[in-house]
């Protein structure tokens, strides 16, 4: 499932890019899942994707910000774990998560992505995959 891993890693890079422009984002509070319970990662991931992160339309960074936000919302390649989790009805709703400003929102999104990469690697035989 290298494509899945690449996609997750790319999302982290896009989040890091957006963190450079945090002062150019609308300072709105957004649902930001943290300490997500096991098997609710994909549900939390979709909460991050649904959040209305927006450019403040100031300065000349508007285009790169909008493109980055759009790329964050792209559907990643699905995995067996993701397909299984989509059927769970017990995960918290997006609205139930604490709302945070863009800086913390992006940091929490990155943490979730890192957790998902770690889980993905842990579910595979150690050392058997090509980087």
């Amino acid at each position: 499932q290298d494509r899945h891993m690449i996609r997750m890693r790319q999302l982290i890079d896009i989040v890091d890019q957006l963190k450079n422009y945090v002062n150019d984002l609308v300072p709105e509070f957004l649902p930001a899942p943290e300490d997500v319970e096991t098997n609710c990662e994909w549900s939390a991931f979709s909460c991050f994707q649904k959040a209305q992160l927006k450019s403040a339309n100031t300065g000349n960074n508007e285009r790169i910000i909008n493109v980055s936000i759009k790329k964050l919302k792209r559907k990643p390649p699905s995995t067996n774990a993701g397909r299984r989790q989509k059927h769970r009805l017990t995960c918290p709703s997006c609205d139930s998560y604490e709302k945070k400003p863009p800086k913390e929102f992006l940091e929490r999104f990155k943490s979730l992505l890192q957790k998902m990469i770690h889980q993905h690697l842990s579910s595979r035989t150690h050392g058997s995959e090509d980087s």
């Epitope: 290298d2 690449i6 790319q10």
Partner: antibody, heavy 117, light 106 residues
Framework: QVQLVQSGAEVKKPGASVKVSCKAS????????MHWVRQAPGQGLEWMGL????????IYNQKFKGRVTMTRDTSTSTVYMELSSLRSEDTAVYYC??????????WGQGTLVTVSS | DIQMTQSPSSLSASVGDRVTITCRAS??????LNWYQQKPGKAPKLLIY???RLHSGVPSRFSGSGSGTDFTLTISSLQPEDFATYYC????????FGGGTKVEIK
């Protein structure tokens, strides 16, 4: 097999620009992003940035922002790195490297760019 | 920016020796660390990714360990083809390389 073949050595004057190419083969070009890394003579490696080969989205090292431009041509499976306002400190070997799942898994052979008056 | 510091910058060793190279990050990078080998006039080659995972085709005498800020690359029994420069690289936040460690023949 995966291959990244770069353009030949260049000699440039200070203030000029250079455009280095990197032709990919052996895999689906738009499935993998590409990094650019440089190495000054006798020095370590320095990450310059990356490009999404499917849509030209770029992320640059802040150090090079405003001077570096990364582009791609899907018809020839080639990525380009252009560096402008060259100075002597830009003398280096420039590498393209494929964005693997968690690492730069394949590298080009490198292109030496010499900046000298 | 995350800084990566490698030590030593160079070392002399003999064939069969056990060699250890360390890499320290200026902040916590979890397991987001890779190791590359570079020989003179050649491009770097990936050895180890995600701290301890061997890239395909890399001999098992190479191993990596660590977490957080301190990492180690170990060559259990140095072979003639292992004399080269080794670089660590973080990918927790974008990418940064260490300064390199040159492994020379004693």
């Amino acid at each position: 097999q995966v291959q990244l073949v770069q353009s030949g050595a260049e000699v440039k004057k200070p203030g000029a620009s250079v455009k280095v190419s990197c032709k990919a083969s052996g895999y689906t070009f738009t499935d993998y992003w590409m990094h650019w890394v440089r190495q000054a003579p006798g020095q370590g490696l320095e990450w310059m940035g990356l490009i999404d080969t499917s849509d030209s989205y770029t992320i640059y090292n802040q150090k090079f922002k405003g001077r570096v431009t990364m582009t791609r041509d899907t018809s020839t499976s080639t990525v380009y790195m252009e560096l402008s306002s060259l100075r002597s400190e830009d003398t280096a070997v420039y590498y393209c490297a494929r964005y693997g799942p968690l690492a730069m898994d394949y590298w080009g052979q490198g292109t030496l760019v010499t900046v000298s008056s | 920016d995350i800084q990566m510091t490698q030590s030593p910058s160079s070392l002399s060793a003999s064939v069969g020796d056990r060699v250890t190279i360390t890499c320290r990050a200026s902040q916590d990078i979890s397991n987001y660390l890779n190791w590359y080998q570079q020989k003179p006039g050649k491009a770097p080659k990936l050895l180890i990714y995600y701290t301890s995972r061997l890239h395909s085709g890399v001999p098992s005498r190479f191993s990596g360990s660590g977490s957080g800020t301190d990492f180690t690359l170990t060559i259990s029994s140095l072979q003639p083809e292992d004399f080269a420069t080794y670089y660590c690289q973080q990918f927790n936040t974008l990418r940064t390389f260490g300064g390199g460690t040159k492994v020379e023949i004693k």
